[in-house]
Interface confidence: medium
C-alpha cells in the first residue's frame, strides 16, 4: 500500500526540490492540530493566532473574544483556564520545566466580571499544579509539595497538608518515578464531579535512593540534582489517597481511601482514580510485580465522614502471560447507572478489547471482539459508546472512530472515520463535548493533517476547523519520498513494516538502508501517520531507504506478540530488527554492504544489541540516550516487564541483556554513542557505562555527550545532534557531502 | 427574575449633595461589577462611575471625580451612588446597570428603570 | 479617552426596510463593541455585545459585524417596535465609553 503517492509527474520534476536538513531543523513542514477547549455541550474556547482566547458557539455560529492578547502580554501570560462558572480566568506565566509533564509557574486569576486582576490574597510563586474546581470558581494548587484550597480566588487560602517536603513528602504532585511511569501527569489530585470532594495522594519518597548528577551551568562550581528514582529492585515510593470535604474542610480533615487488603499485603502501587460522582470514587491499585491489579469502587459514608470500600466492589485483573494491561492498565468508564462501567482488558484469545462490568469481572460482558485491538473509550453517553480501533481493513498502524449504539438491542457499530477521507485520513483521535453534543476528530495522516467538527447525533462534519494548507502549498515544490506500509510472515509471527523510499526509487538500483528502531514493550512504530523530518529528509536528499519495523513486544496486534518479551527485554525485539532486514536484502534493491541501524532511548539499548548481534548484516548504527542495563532503569517501568533483578527472581536475564555483556562485538561496526549529561530519565550512567566496557575491551568507537541536556536533547542540541549524526550516516554510506 | 430598582432623585440644589441607590435581585450580586450611567435631557448615555464585585475598586468619569463616590453593600445587595457639590450640568437620569461577567470585554446587560436628579435653584 | 462616532445621526424608514448604523472608535478596540436599543422614557437594552453576539431574548433580525475600529449593526427587515435610539460603547478600556445615538424615525 502506497501511503504517499508520488504528488508529480516527471514534466514537473525539474521545479522540484528535495528535502533539506535545514527544513527539517527549522520545522519548515511542521503541521497544526486543533483541538477545541471544550467549555459545555456547544461551547469551546480556542487561542487565537494573534493570542486572542476566543469562545466559539457552534450552534449560534458567534464567536467572541473573552480574553484579549492585550490583558495575557500583561503578565506574560503563555496558557489560561477558564473557571467553569465563567467568573474567572487563570493565567500562566513563567513557565519552568521540570520533567516530563511537570513545571512550575506564577499564576495571575483575572476576574471576567470586574473586568481586573484579582488583587489580595496573590497566590504564592513558583506553584507547582493548580486548578479549577469542576464546578464554580474554587482553586485547589500545590506550593512547596503543600495542597492549599481558595472558596474563591480573592479568599485567603485554607492549607490542607502541612508535611510536604523536597524530595521527601509529595502531596498532590507525583514524584519522579510515578509522575514518569504511572501516572503520566503533572498532578495528583482529582475534584469530584460538582468540587464536592477533593481526593489526593500523598508519595512518601524518604527512603527512596537518591540518584545525584552534575549540572555544569555558569558558575564557578557545578551544581548536583538529586532526584530520588527508585531503579530496578530499589525501595519504591510510599502512597496514600486522602480525600477532603472542600465545602467544609476544617470539619473533619483529610480522610484516607483504605487499600485494598489483598494489594496491601505487599508492595504496591496507586495507577489511577476516578471519580464516579460526589460520593463514589474509584481507586485502582497495582501489586509491584505487575501482572494483579485490583479496582476499587469506594462510597462516602454521611454518618461517620469515611470512605468505605466494600469487597463486593473489588474488581481484579490478572495477567497470566505477562503483566496487567497494555503499557498501563487500562481505567474504567462508568456509566450513568453510576455503578457499571467499560473497561479495555484482554479477551480469552488475548486481544484487547471493550467489556462492560456490571457486578463481577467474571461475568463482564463483551462489547467488542475480533483479531485487532480496541484502543481507547472516548466518551460513553446514555445511548452511544464512542472509542478508536486498529480494525479497519486490517492495518494495526491505523486509528479509526466507532460508535457503539448502546442504547439499541443489539447494539450497532459504525465506522466514524472509516470512509470520511480514505487516502488521506486512517490515523484519527477525537475529543468530545460534554454529553457527546459534538466532537472534534483530529486526523494524523497518512496524508496531511486535518481537524473537523461534527454533530455527536449524526456524525455529519460542521467544518473544518484546521486543514494545513500553508503546508499542503509549502509541499508543492518538494520530492517528498514515497511511503509504503507492508508485512512480513516469519515463522508465525507478523512483522509490519513502512519503507520509506527515495523519490526516483527504482527497484532495480541498490540503495543503502537505515533501520529506525524503537521497539519498546507496548509501543508502535509502523503507523499511517503524516511526517516530515529527519529521516524522510535522508531518503528525499541522500537517497537512503529507511525502514521501521515492529517486532516482538509490540503493541495493538494481541497478546502474544505483546507478552512474547516478558522478563526477556533484549532478545526478541533485536531478533526481529535483524530478521526484516535480512527479508529487505532479499527484495533486492538493498545494498547490503551499506545497512545502518540507529535509535533513541529503548531504540538505542535495540540498535546498540543490533549492532553487536555478531551477524554482520550492520556497517554502522547509532545509540541516542540508550539503555544499557535494567538494573540503571526505573523501578515501575523495568519489573512490569523484567521482573525483578534477585537470585530467585530474574536477575540472571537482567545480567545477560546488558549492552556491556557484547563490548567485544562492537569491534566490526562503527558505533556513535550520544547522551545528554542531565538526562533524568535514562541517566547518563547508562553510556558511562557502555563507553568504559569497550574502552576496557579496547574497542573504537565514536561518542558525543550534550552538557546539561535531558532526554530530549531540545533546543540548539537538536541541531547539532542531527547534524553530527547526518555526518556520521553519510561517511558510514560513503555519500559525498 | 433580574432586576435593579434605583431610587434617591429628586430635586437638589447646586452644591448641594444626593445619595442615590440601586437594589438588585435575582443574580449573585457580589460577583459583578456595576456601573452608573447618566443621560441629560434629550441627550446621549454617559458613563458615571464603575465599582468591582468586592468593592474594593472603583474608578469615576473625569467629570465627577472628587465629587461622587460609588460603594456597594453586598449583604445588602444594593448599589449607592453618593453624589456631593452637584451642578446644574449633573441633572440628568441615572441608570445603574450590571456589568456582564464571561468575557473581558464585558457588556451592561441588565438596567434599572433610572432615577431623575434635577439640579436647580 | 476612546472616541466613539455613530453615523448616521438620524434616519427615517419603513416597516420592512433595511436599516444599517456604523460605529467608528478612535483606535482599535478589537471587538470590543455593545450594541443598545432605547426607546423614549426607558432604560436601553442590550442587543450585541462582543461586535456580532446577539444577546438572548434579542430578534434574529438584527446582527452586528466589525472589529477594529470599524462596525455595524444591521436590522435585516424593521419592524414598528424597532423605532428608537440606538447606542453603541466599547469596552475595550476604561472609560468605557458611548457614541452619541442613531435616532431611528417612521417615515
Known amino acids: 500500500i502506497v501511503l504517499r503517492p508520488p504528488r508529480v509527474h516527471n514534466s514537473e520534476e525539474n521545479t522540484m526540490r528535495a528535502l533539506t536538513l535545514k527544513d527539517i531543523l527549522n520545522g519548515t513542514f511542521s503541521y497544526k492540530t486543533f483541538f477545541p477547549n471544550w467549555i459545555s455541550g456547544q461551547e469551546y474556547l480556542h487561542q487565537s493566532a494573534d493570542n486572542n482566547i476566543v469562545l466559539y458557539n457552534i450552534e449560534t455560529g458567534q464567536s467572541y473574544t473573552i480574553l484579549s492578547n492585550r490583558t495575557m502580554k500583561s503578565v506574560n501570560a503563555s496558557n489560561y483556564g477558564l473557571s467553569p462558572d465563567r467568573q474567572f480566568v487563570y493565567l500562566e506565566s513563567d513557565y519552568s520545566k521540570l520533567w516530563r509533564y511537570s513545571y512550575t509557574a506564577t499564576y495571575y486569576i483575572y476576574d471576567l466580571s470586574n473586568g481586573e486582576f484579582v488583587r489580595g490574597n496573590e497566590l504564592p510563586r513558583p506553584i507547582q499544579y493548580l486548578c479549577w474546581s469542576p464546578v464554580g470558581s474554587k482553586l485547589a494548587y500545590v506550593y512547596q509539595n503543600n495542597i492549599y484550597l481558595k472558596q474563591r480566588p480573592g479568599d485567603p487560602p485554607f492549607q490542607i497538608t502541612f508535611n510536604g517536603r523536597e524530595n521527601k513528602i509529595f502531596n498532590g504532585i507525583p514524584d519522579w518515578v510515578y509522575e514518569e511511569e504511572m501516572l503520566a501527569t503533572k498532578y495528583a489530585l482529582w475534584w469530584s464531579p460538582n468540587g464536592k470532594f477533593l481526593a489526593y495522594a500523598e508519595f512518601n519518597d524518604t527512603d527512596i535512593p537518591v540518584i545525584a548528577y552534575s549540572y555544569y551551568g555558569d558558575e564557578q562550581y557545578p551544581r548536583t540534582i538529586n532526584i530520588p528514582y527508585p531503579k530496578a529492585g530499589a525501595k519504591n515510593p510510599f502512597v496514600r489517597i486522602f480525600i477532603i470535604d472542600t465545602t467544609y474542610p476544617a470539619y473533619v480533615g483529610p480522610q484516607e481511601v483504605p487499600v485494598p487488603a489483598m494489594i496491601a499485603s505487599s508492595d504496591y502501587y496507586f495507577s489511577w482514580l476516578t471519580w464516579v460522582t460526589d460520593e463514589r470514587v474509584c481507586l485502582q491499585w497495582l501489586k509491584r510485580v505487575q501482572n494483579v491489579s485490583v479496582l476499587s469502587i469506594c462510597d462516602f459514608r454521611e454518618d461517620w465522614q469515611t470512605w468505605d470500600c466494600p469487597k463486593t466492589q473489588e474488581h481484579i485483573e490478572e495477567s497470566r502471560t505477562g503483566w496487567a494491561g497494555g503499557f498501563f492498565v487500562s481505567t474504567p468508564v462508568f456509566s450513568y447507572d453510576a455503578i457499571s462501567y467499560y473497561k479495555i482488558f484482554s479477551d480469552k484469545d488475548g486481544y484487547k478489547h471493550i467489556h462492560y462490568i456490571k457486578d463481577t469481572v467474571e461475568n463482564a460482558i463483551q462489547i467488542t471482539s475480533g483479531k485487532w485491538e480496541a484502543i481507547n473509550i472516548f466518551r460513553v453517553t446514555q445511548d452511544s459508546l464512542f472509542y478508536s480501533s486498529n480494525e479497519f481493513e486490517d492495518y494495526p498502524g491505523r486509528r479509526n472512530i466507532y460508535r457503539i449504539s448502546i442504547g439499541s438491542y443489539p447494539p450497532s457499530k459504525k465506522c466514524v472515520t472509516c470512509h470520511l477521507r480514505k487516502e488521506r485520513c486512517q490515523y484519527y483521535t477525537a475529543s468530545f463535548s460534554d454529553y457527546a453534543k459534538y466532537y472534534a476528530l483530529v486526523c494524523y495522516g497518512p496524508g496531511i493533517p486535518i481537524s473537523t467538527l461534527h454533530d455527536g447525533r449524526t456524525d455529519q462534519e460542521i467544518k473544518i476547523l484546521e486543514e494545513n494548507k500553508e503546508l499542503e502549498n509549502a509541499l508543492k515544490n518538494i520530492q517528498l519520498p514515497k511511503e509504503e506500509i507492508k508485512k512480513l510472515e516469519v515463522d508465525e509471527i507478523t512483522l509490519w513494516y513502512k519503507m520509506i523510499l527515495p523519490p526516483q526509487f527504482d527497484r532495480s538500483k541498490k540503495y543503502p538502508l537505515l533501520i529506525q528502531v524503537y521497539g519498546g514493550p507496548c509501543s508502535q512504530s509502523v503507523r499511517s501517520v503524516f511526517a516530515v523530518n529527519w529521516i524522510s529528509y535522508l531518503a528525499s536528499k541522500e537517497g537512503m531507504v529507511i525502514a521501521l519495523v515492529d517486532g516482538r513486544g509490540t503493541a495493538f496486534q494481541g497478546d502474544k506478540l505483546l507478552y512474547a518479551v516478558y522478563r526477556k527485554l533484549g532478545v526478541y525485539e533485536v531478533e526481529d530488527q535483524i530478521t526484516a532486514v535480512r527479508k529487505f536484502i532479499e527484495m533486492g534493491f538493498i545494498d547490503e554492504k551499506r545497512i545502518a541501524i540507529w535509535g533513541w532511548s529503548y531504540g538505542g539499548y535495540v540498535s546498540s544489541l543490533a549492532l553487536a548481534s555478531g551477524t554482520g548484516l550492520f556497517k554502522c548504527g547509532i545509540a541516542v540516550a540508550p539503555v544499557s542495563s535494567w538494573e540503571y532503569y526505573a523501578s515501575v517501568y523495568t519489573e512490569r516487564f523484567m521482573g525483578l533483578p534477585t537470585k530467585d527472581d530474574n536477575l540472571e536475564h537482567y545480567k545477560n541483556s546488558t549492552v556491556m555483556a557484547r563490548a567485544e562485538y562492537f569491534r566490526n561496526v562503527d558505533y556513535l554513542l550520544i547522551h545528554g549529561t542531565a538526562d533524568d530519565n535514562v541517566h547518563f550512567q547508562n553510556s558511562a557505562q557502555i563507553a568504559k566496557a569497550l574502552v576496557n575491551a579496547q574497542v573504537d568507537f565514536q561518542a558525543m555527550w550534550y552538557s546539561d541536556q535531558n532526554h530530549g536533547l531540545s533546543g540548539l542540541s537538536t541541531n547539532h545532534l542531527y547534524t553530527h549524526m547526518t555526518h556520521f550516516l553519510k561517511q558510514c554510506f560513503s555519500l559525498s557531502d | 427574575e433580574v432586576q435593579l430598582v434605583e431610587s434617591g432623585g429628586g430635586l437638589v440644589q447646586p452644591g448641594g449633595s444626593l445619595r442615590l441607590s440601586c437594589a438588585a435581585s435575582?443574580?449573585?450580586?457580589?460577583?459583578?461589577?456595576m456601573i452608573w450611567v447618566r443621560q441629560a435631557p434629550g441627550k446621549g448615555l454617559e458613563w458615571v462611575s464603575a465599582i468591582s464585585g468586592s468593592g474594593g475598586y472603583t474608578f469615576n468619569a473625569d467629570s465627577v471625580k472628587g465629587r461622587f463616590t460609588m460603594s456597594r453593600d453586598n449583604s445588602k445587595n444594593t448599589l449607592y451612588l453618593q453624589m456631593n457639590s452637584l451642578r446644574a450640568e449633573d441633572t440628568a437620569v441615572y441608570y445603574c446597570?450590571?456589568?456582564?461577567?464571561?468575557?473581558?470585554?464585558?457588556?451592561?446587560?441588565?438596567w434599572g428603570q433610572g432615577t431623575l436628579v434635577t439640579v436647580s435653584s | 479617552d476612546i472616541q466613539m462616532t455613530q453615523s448616521p445621526s438620524s434616519l427615517s424608514a419603513s416597516v420592512g426596510d433595511r436599516v444599517t448604523i456604523t460605529c467608528r472608535a478612535s483606535q482599535s478596540i478589537s471587538s470590543y463593541l455593545n450594541w443598545y436599543q432605547q426607546k423614549p422614557g426607558k432604560a436601553p437594552k442590550l442587543l450585541i455585545y462582543?461586535?456580532?453576539s446577539l444577546q438572548s431574548g434579542v430578534p434574529s433580525r438584527f446582527s452586528g459585524s466589525g472589529s477594529g475600529t470599524d462596525f455595524t449593526l444591521t436590522i435585516s427587515s424593521l419592524q414598528p417596535e424597532d423605532f428608537a435610539t440606538y447606542y453603541c460603547?466599547?469596552?475595550?478600556?476604561?472609560?468605557?465609553?458611548f457614541g452619541q445615538g442613531t435616532k431611528v424615525e417612521i417615515k
Open positions: 446597570a450590571k456589568r456582564d461577567g464571561g468575557y473581558e470585554g464585558g457588556a451592561f446587560d441588565i
Open positions: 435575582g443574580f449573585t450580586f457580589s460577583s459583578y461589577a
Open positions: 460603547q466599547q469596552s475595550y478600556s476604561t472609560p468605557p465609553t
Open positions: 462582543a461586535a456580532s
